[in-house]
C-alpha cells in the first residue's frame, strides 16, 4: 500500500498532501480509514479536505489515524493512504526523535537548511529560526524565503534546527513548527580523469650525461580521498621494474598532496649516473584512477656541461 | 529502441496455470504504468490487467480473482499469473506501455509483439 | 462499463480518397481536465496494434499527417486524409476514462 508518514503537534496546523499524485483538476476524495466515514470539504470543520491536501487546524492527538486518499483520475482510481500522528506538545526543549524531519548535511560552501514540509502552507516571511531551542541571532543567520542560510559553518553549528511560521486560512492563524538535524561534513569529494601536470606532454628534458637526472611524474585526480588512484614511470613501455636497469629507480612511496584542495601524486623518478643510452628511451609519465589513464610521453636531450653566456 | 518483448506463452489445460513476462528496454520502466491487452483469433482487443507506478493493479470482472498483475522494476519486468485459465481465455496477450507518471497520458504507445496463449483439453 | 461502438465494421477504400470511421462512447469521454480520453489504434494485418491518435485529437510520434482524430464528449472521428495501401489493417477506438474498453473494430481494405 502507498502510505505516507505524517506528523504534528496538539494546537498546532497540519497539512498532509495525498501521497498519490494528480492534476490540480482531478477529484479527490478524503476517508478516515478506521470508519471508512468521509472527510468534510467545508472549511468550517476543524479537519477538512481541500483537494490533494488534507487540513488540520489545528490538530488535536485523537486525530492521529490512517487516512485514505482516493485521486479521481482518468484510467484508474489512485489510492494512497496517510498515515498522521498527532504528538502532545513537550514540556521542555527536546525535540524527540519521532518529531524530526530528515537530516540535513552542510559545508563551508553549502549550509541551506530548508523548513520541511512548509510548501504546504500558506505562509508569510519572515520564518522564525532556534536551535536546541534558543532563538538564532547574529550576523552569520540569514532566514531567506524557506530556508535558513548559515554564514562561514562550523563543526559547532550542528544540531537540531527549528522553523517556526504561521499558517493562514480564511483570516485565522494557526501556528507550525518543524525541526531537523543538521551535521557538517567536510566539501564532498569528487572524482575525474587523471590531469598531468607535469611533465608536459612530449618535454624534452636536458641532463648531463654522467650526472644524475630527477623527472617527476605529478598528476590530479579529484577532490578528497581517491579509492582508485596512481602515478607511476615506463621505460619504452615496460615497467621499471622489468626494465632491469639497476641505475633508474622510482621513488618508493607516492606523495599525496592536496593542492587547491585537489588530491594529487607525484612519483619520482631518479637515473644516476646518466649514459648516452639513456637518451635513446622514451620516458612515460602514466596517470590511472577508474575514469582511465593518461599518459605523458618525456625524452631526454644532453645538456652541454659549459653553457657559455655572452 | 523502446522495446517489450513477451513470453511464457503456450499450451494448457482448462483450470491450469500459466505466467507471462514482459522485458521492458529503452526507457524508465518505473515511471509507467504496465498492462496486458488479449486478443483472440479473428477478435478484437480486451484489456485484461493494469499495475501503475506503486504496484497498485487493476482487473475488469472478467479476470478478478483468477489473474495477478506485478512488476519487478529492477528487472524492467511485468507479470501476468493466470491461474485457473477457460478456454474463453485462448487470445494473443500484449505486453502494453501506459500511462507516464500517475497522470501524463500519451495513450498505449509502445506494445510489444504478444504471446499465444492456448487453452484447451 | 463505458461501451464502444465503431462503425462502420468494413470499410473499402480506394487509394487517394478521403476515409472516415466513427466511434461512440455510452457515456462523455470529456474529463475535468479538459482531454478527451479517446484513443484511435491501428492493427495491419499480422502486426501489434501501434497508437494513431491519443487524448481524442494528438497525433502519436512517427505518424503522418493524414491522420487526424476530432470530437468530443460521446462521438469521435478518425479521418485519413488521403487512403495509402499501407494504411489497411483493423482500427480501434478505446476510452481511458474508466478502465480501458476498446471498440469492435472498423476493418479497412482497398476496394
Known amino acids: 500500500k502507498f502510505s505516507k508518514q505524517s506528523w504534528g503537534l496538539e494546537n498546532e496546523a497540519l497539512i498532509v498532501r495525498c501521497p498519490r499524485q494528480g492534476k490540480p483538476s482531478y477529484t479527490v476524495d478524503w476517508y478516515y480509514s478506521q470508519t471508512n466515514k468521509s472527510i468534510p470539504t467545508q472549511e468550517r470543520n476543524r479537519v477538512f479536505a481541500s483537494g490533494q491536501l488534507l487540513k488540520f487546524l489545528p490538530a488535536a492527538v485523537a486525530d492521529s489515524g490512517i487516512y485514505t486518499c482516493i485521486v479521481r483520475s482518468p484510467t484508474f482510481n489512485r489510492t494512497g493512504y496517510a498515515n498522521v500522528t498527532i504528538y502532545k506538545k513537550q514540556s521542555d526543549c527536546n525535540v524527540p526523535d519521532y518529531l524530526m524531519y530528515s537530516t540535513v548535511s552542510g559545508s563551508e560552501k553549502n549550509s541551506k537548511i530548508y523548513c520541511p514540509t512548509i510548501d504546504l502552507y500558506n505562509w508569510t516571511a519572515p520564518l522564525e529560526w532556534f536551535k536546541n531551542c534558543q532563538a538564532l541571532q547574529g550576523s552569520r543567520y540569514r532566514a531567506h524565503k524557506s530556508f535558513l542560510v548559515i554564514d562561514n559553518v562550523m563543526t559547532e553549528d550542528a544540531g537540531d534546527y527549528t522553523c517556526k511560521f504561521i499558517h493562514n486560512e480564511n483570516g485565522a492563524n494557526y501556528s507550525v513548527t518543524a525541526t531537523r538535524s543538521f551535521t557538517v561534513k567536510d566539501e564532498q569529494g569528487f572524482s575525474l580523469f587523471p590531469v598531468i601536470g607535469a611533465p608536459a606532454q612530449n618535454e624534452i628534458k636536458e641532463v648531463e650525461i654522467g650526472k644524475n637526472a630527477n623527472l617527476t611524474c605529478s598528476a590530479c585526480f579529484g577532490k578528497g580521498t581517491q579509492f582508485l588512484a596512481a602515478v607511476l614511470w615506463q621505460l619504452n613501455g615496460t615497467k621499471i621494474t622489468d626494465f632491469g636497469e639497476p641505475r633508474i629507480q622510482q621513488e618508493e612511496g607516492q606523495n599525496q598532496s592536496f593542492s587547491n584542495g585537489l588530491a594529487c601524486l607525484d612519483m619520482v623518478l631518479r637515473i644516476a649516473d646518466v649514459k648516452e643510452e639513456d637518451l635513446l628511451l622514451q620516458y612515460d609519465c602514466l596517470a590511472l584512477n577508474l575514469h582511465g589513464l593518461r599518459r605523458h610521453t618525456v625524452r631526454l636531450s644532453r645538456k652541454n656541461p659549459i653553457d657559455h653566456h655572452s | 529502441e523502446v522495446q517489450l518483448v513477451e513470453s511464457g506463452g503456450g499450451w494448457v489445460q482448462p483450470g491450469g496455470s500459466l505466467r507471462l513476462s514482459c522485458a521492458a528496454s529503452?526507457?524508465?520502466?518505473?515511471?509507467?504504468?504496465m498492462y496486458w491487452v488479449r486478443q483472440a483469433t479473428g477478435k478484437g482487443l480486451e484489456w485484461v490487467s493494469g499495475i501503475d507506478t506503486v504496484g497498485d493493479t487493476y482487473y475488469p470482472d472478467s479476470v478478478k480473482g483468477r489473474f495477478t498483475i506485478s512488476r519487478e522494476n529492477a528487472k524492467n519486468s511485468v507479470y501476468l499469473q493466470m491461474n485457473t485459465l477457460r478456454a474463453g481465455d485462448t487470445a494473443v496477450y500484449y505486453c502494453v506501455r501506459g500511462i507516464y507518471g500517475d497522470f501524463y497520458y500519451y495513450g498505449l504507445d509502445v506494445w510489444g509483439h504478444g504471446t499465444t496463449v492456448t487453452v484447451s483439453s | 462499463d463505458i461501451v464502444m461502438t465503431q462503425s462502420p465494421l468494413s470499410l473499402p477504400v480506394t487509394p487517394g480518397e478521403p476515409a472516415s470511421i466513427s466511434c461512440r462512447s455510452s457515456q462523455s469521454l470529456l474529463y475535468s481536465d479538459g482531454n478527451n480520453y479517446l484513443d484511435w489504434y491501428l492493427q495491419k494485418p499480422g502486426q501489434s496494434p501501434h497508437l494513431l491518435i491519443y487524448?481524442?485529437?494528438n497525433r502519436a510520434s512517427g505518424v503522418p499527417d493524414r491522420f487526424s482524430g476530432s470530437g468530443s464528449g460521446t462521438d469521435f472521428t478518425l479521418k485519413i486524409s488521403r487512403v495509402e495501401a499501407d494504411d489497411v489493417g483493423v482500427y480501434y477506438c478505446m476510452q481511458a476514462l474508466q478502465t480501458l474498453t476498446f471498440g469492435g473494430g472498423t476493418k479497412v481494405e482497398i476496394k
Open positions: 529503452g526507457f524508465t520502466f518505473s515511471s509507467y504504468d
Open positions: 487524448l481524442g485529437s
